[in-house]
């Protein structure tokens, strides 16, 4: 029998400075593109090598982005969320939710689409 998988959820404010090639990450999610069941939130799906986010080091694949420059990302269409990031300016403040897996017992399998990464 597999051990129970629990999650530790933490929030963090991450301030990024837009680099020459931008912020350096990809997102999934939105009201028209639910990546996680029953959750239309915006999640980080890729951190680009040597991009601003990667060099900062705090944003991780699987993180949920709650707000950009204080603007809530709830109930946004996917492309509207993309556009919000693209128009966010040079200094970008992200409120993010990290969901860390805490393993109790045997190691389980974390599948694609699981927001923990």
């Amino acid at each position: 029998m597999n051990g129970r998988v629990d999650y530790l959820v933490t929030e963090e404010e991450i301030n990024l400075t837009r680099g020459p090639s931008g912020l350096g990450f990809n997102i999934v999610g939105g009201t028209d593109q639910q990546y996680v069941s029953n959750d239309s939130g915006i999640y980080v799906s890729r951190i680009k090598e040597n991009g601003a986010a990667a060099l900062d080091g705090r944003l991780q694949e699987g993180d949920k982005i709650l707000s950009v420059n204080g603007q809530d990302l709830k109930n946004l269409l996917h492309q509207d969320a993309v556009d919000l990031f693209r128009n966010a300016g040079y200094a970008v403040s992200l409120r993010v939710q990290h969901r860390l897996q805490v393993q109790n017992g045997p190691i389980g399998h974390r599948g694609e689409g699981d927001p923990s990464g």
Epitope: G22, N26, Y35, S45, R46, F85, R86, G113
Partner: nanobody, 125 residues
Framework: QVQLVESGGGSVQAGGSLRLSCTAS????????MAWFRQAPGKEREFVAA??????YYADSVTGRFTISRDNAKNTVYLQMNSLKPEDTAVYYC?????????????????????WGQGTQVTVS
């Protein structure tokens, strides 16, 4: 890890048509940005077409002749190639990345994509 498998390549005479398919693993295919690139012998890999959540993109050399589309229920992206020319002869590669970049999207940049297929040969005589 995403696996990509291309099919549909072959030999055709100039003016003919082919439809390439690329099937991807993974249950969140609808979130993938997908692209086709090609590489002719002795030449660099060249962007052909891409399809993201926001729409389709094409290289100038194929605009009006090639059409990229996707069927999310089948985890498959297609490249319909019409009015083929000898210069379209190449190995055609499917590429994918999960999600949409929050930066300016340059579909022709191979670094935008994390996953690549093995390629399928297209020969136009």
């Amino acid at each position: 890890q995403v696996q990509l498998v291309e099919s549909g390549g072959g030999s055709v005479q100039a003016g003919g048509s082919l439809r390439l398919s690329c099937t991807a693993s993974g249950r969140t295919f609808s979130t993938y940005t997908m692209a086709w690139f090609r590489q002719a012998p002795g030449k660099e890999r060249e962007f052909v077409a891409a399809i993201s959540w926001s729409g389709a993109y094409y290289a100038d050399s194929v605009t009006g002749r090639f059409t990229i589309s996707r069927d999310n229920a089948k985890n498959t992206v297609y490249l319909q190639m019409n009015s083929l020319k000898p210069e379209d002869t190449a190995v055609y590669y499917c590429a994918a990345v999960i999600g949409s970049t929050v930066d300016s999207y340059w579909p022709g940049d191979p670094l935008e994509y994390d996953y690549w297929g093995q390629g399928t040969q297209v020969t136009v005589s």
